[in-house]
């Protein structure tokens, strides 16, 4: 892919007019940002300085204990997957300043516009697999006892990031960069041209895999295991299934607009008023997609059982806390007992 | 009215420059980009790039970058087109064509031709 | 590069005929500001190229309206509604989305 190094002289003003006297003045319009723009670059900064002081302390606090505490190998990962896609919203933040002129050549549209689909699939992905560890818990205590070790959790894991670069490949391969005439403008987006259905296909996977299959089987899981552990009164672990609720209902939540918007747009028409309306939305959608990126610190933090006498506490040891203590509470994208308690304690607590 | 004439053929040998000329009339030369196309005998056309009168600015195809040099003159309101180290594909047709400017009408149409210049490349 | 593909390359019609000609883009000329930047062109024998319709299907000032344009994204066609003698050339389609600005090999329209 060309790298375009040309001076692009300001023309962010002009807005085409249909005129058929070509001699007559073309209208000016303003050079500034659209509200949209406006509010993701405000998301997109305020997600930055969370995201990546908030992941980074988080990977600083769990990697320590992810040898030997299950529950710290599922948040680092976690954690390596929002804190890879904070690292492009520098990138991204320019990009919209710039009126979406992209400067920084075909390899960077590919890849780092693909980073926040690659977290949304591994961030997914790792949820499912840390689900599926707190319901063995619940309904499988024995099993777990026998099996469920540090080993295991680093194949579910590899096999969540394996999985959602493999899913992350269409989207990779779709991206280009288009130079548009006037005004000179480099514009990093997909492009499907002749093939809709390959579009459209993409986007209904994205949505299904990405969205809705989880949101139904998540849903299906933590149902399960509430009735359960309000079946047996386990009023000891409510604040920490909260914590559970709050992480997966935001990634559904923040990811709500990105996924409707897309599945409209790969059914219209480009030229259709709609969708040239959504297209206007986009920078927004994935910004409030990109509020993921920065959510977990902020839910782990607030998750500290006492949490009003830690805020006197330095930031990683208050995450230390929350993240590797081995109670109920540090476990917060779970609400049983971590590893170390005693498969009897863990049944009791639930 | 609008016109655009162009420069008479030219004869040239390979590896020889060759500096054609476009002159505007009828019309505000600097409010107006001046395009450059490019036809081969019984082939489709080709754009070469544009020249901003006004600013001095140009936008070369990636493919003529090396090839063409857009020059214009104000006080003629004429614009040039040299090509370099001439080969035998530079035998073709040169049209100058014009397009709105950034002000007055539409940049993406090219609305007045001019009759073209041949260029012939022989040994 | 975007390529534009015209089909036919040649076309015969008789006088009072309806006449059209296809043009398809490698990639979808949709503009960020939403208009599509595909036009069409005639090239009278020797003579140099003269506008006829842009942007899909706005024809140009003094252009007859037997001559329409249609089409989105990346396919296009020419309709002539009632071919007249005057109308015989080389019609080119074009797109001014993308740089470098690109033509179609041409369609020979020929009277029969």
């Known amino acids: 892919m060309d790298s375009f190094n040309y001076t692009t002289p300001d023309y962010g003003h002009y807005d085409d007019k249909d005129t058929l006297d070509l001699n007559t003045p073309v209208d000016k319009t303003s050079n500034t940002l659209r509200v949209p723009d406006i509010l993701a670059l405000v998301i997109f900064a305020v997600v930055f300085l969370v995201g990546v002081l908030g992941n980074a302390l988080v990977v600083w606090v769990t990697a320590f204990e992810a040898k030997r505490t299950i529950n710290a190998i599922w948040f680092l990962n976690l954690a390596v997957a929002d804190f890879l896609s904070c690292l492009a919203l520098p990138i991204l933040f320019t990009s919209i300043v710039q009126h979406h002129h992209w400067p920084f050549g075909g390899a960077a549209c590919s890849i780092l516009p693909s980073l926040i689909l690659l977290n949304m699939y591994a961030s997914i992905l790792l949820l499912a697999t840390i689900s599926a560890d707190r319901f063995l818990l619940v309904f499988k205590p024995i099993w777990c006892q026998n099996f469920r070790g540090a080993g295991l959790a680093w194949i579910a894991c590899a096999v969540a990031w394996g999985l959602a670069l493999l899913l992350t490949i269409p989207s990779f391969l779709y991206r280009v960069v288009r130079e548009e005439y006037f005004p000179p403008k480099v514009l990093c987006g997909v492009d499907y041209s002749h093939d809709k259905r390959r579009e459209r296909a993409v986007a209904i996977v994205r949505l299904v895999l990405g969205f809705l299959w989880p949101l139904l089987t998540l849903t299906i899981c933590y149902t399960f295991i509430l009735l359960r552990t309000w079946s047996r009164r386990a009023t000891r672990s409510t604040k920490t299934l909260k914590v559970v609720v709050a992480v997966v209902a935001s990634f559904f939540i923040f990811w709500l607009p990105y996924q409707v918007t897309g599945i409209m747009m790969s059914f219209l028409e480009p030229s259709s008023p709609t969708f040239l309306l959504l297209k206007k939305l986009d920078s927004l959608c994935v910004s409030f997609a990109y509020i993921n990126c920065c959510i977990n610190p902020i839910i782990y933090v607030v998750a500290g059982q006492g949490f009003q006498g830690r805020l006197r506490k330095s930031l990683p040891s208050l995450l230390r806390n929350v993240l590797t203590e081995e109670s109920v509470v540090r476990e917060s994208k779970s609400f049983t007992r971590s590893t170390v308690d005693t498969m009897a304690q863990k049944t009791q607590a639930v | 009215q609008v016109q655009l004439q162009q420069s008479g053929a030219e004869l040239t040998k390979p590896g020889a420059s060759v500096k054609l000329s476009c002159k505007a009339s009828?019309?505000?030369?600097?409010?107006?980009?001046m395009h450059w196309v490019k036809q081969r005998p019984g082939q489709g056309l080709e754009w070469i790039g544009y020249?901003?009168?006004?600013?001095?600015?140009?936008k070369y195809n990636q493919k003529f970058k090396d090839k063409a040099t857009l020059t214009a003159d104000k006080s003629s309101s004429t614009a040039y087109m040299q090509l370099n180290s001439l080969t035998y594909e530079d035998s073709a047709v040169y049209y100058c064509?014009?397009?709105?400017?950034?002000?007055?009408?539409?940049?993406?149409?090219?609305?007045?031709w001019g009759q073209g210049t041949t260029v012939t490349v022989s040994s | 590069d975007v390529v534009m593909t015209q089909t036919p390359l040649s076309l015969t019609v008789s006088l009072g005929d309806q006449a059209s000609i296809s043009c398809r883009s490698s990639?979808?000329?949709?503009?960020?500001?939403?208009?599509?930047?595909l036009h069409w062109y005639l090239q009278k024998p020797g003579q140099s190229p003269k506008f006829l319709i842009y942007?899909?299907?706005n024809r140009f000032s003094g252009v007859p309206d037997r001559f329409s344009g249609s089409g989105s994204g990346t396919d296009f066609r020419l309709k002539i509604s009632r071919v007249e003698a005057e109308d015989l050339g080389v019609y080119f389609c074009?797109?001014?989305?993308?740089?470098?600005?690109?033509f179609g090999a041409g369609t020979k329209l020929e009277i029969k």
């Open positions: 074009s797109q001014s989305t993308l740089v470098p600005l690109t």
């Open positions: 020249l901003n009168p006004s600013s001095g600015y140009t």
């Open positions: 009828g019309y505000t030369f600097t409010n107006y980009w």
């Open positions: 990639q979808s000329l949709v503009h960020s500001n939403g208009n599509t930047y």
């Open positions: 064509t014009r397009s709105g400017g950034d002000n007055y009408g539409n940049p993406y149409y090219f609305d007045r």
């Open positions: 942007k899909v299907s």
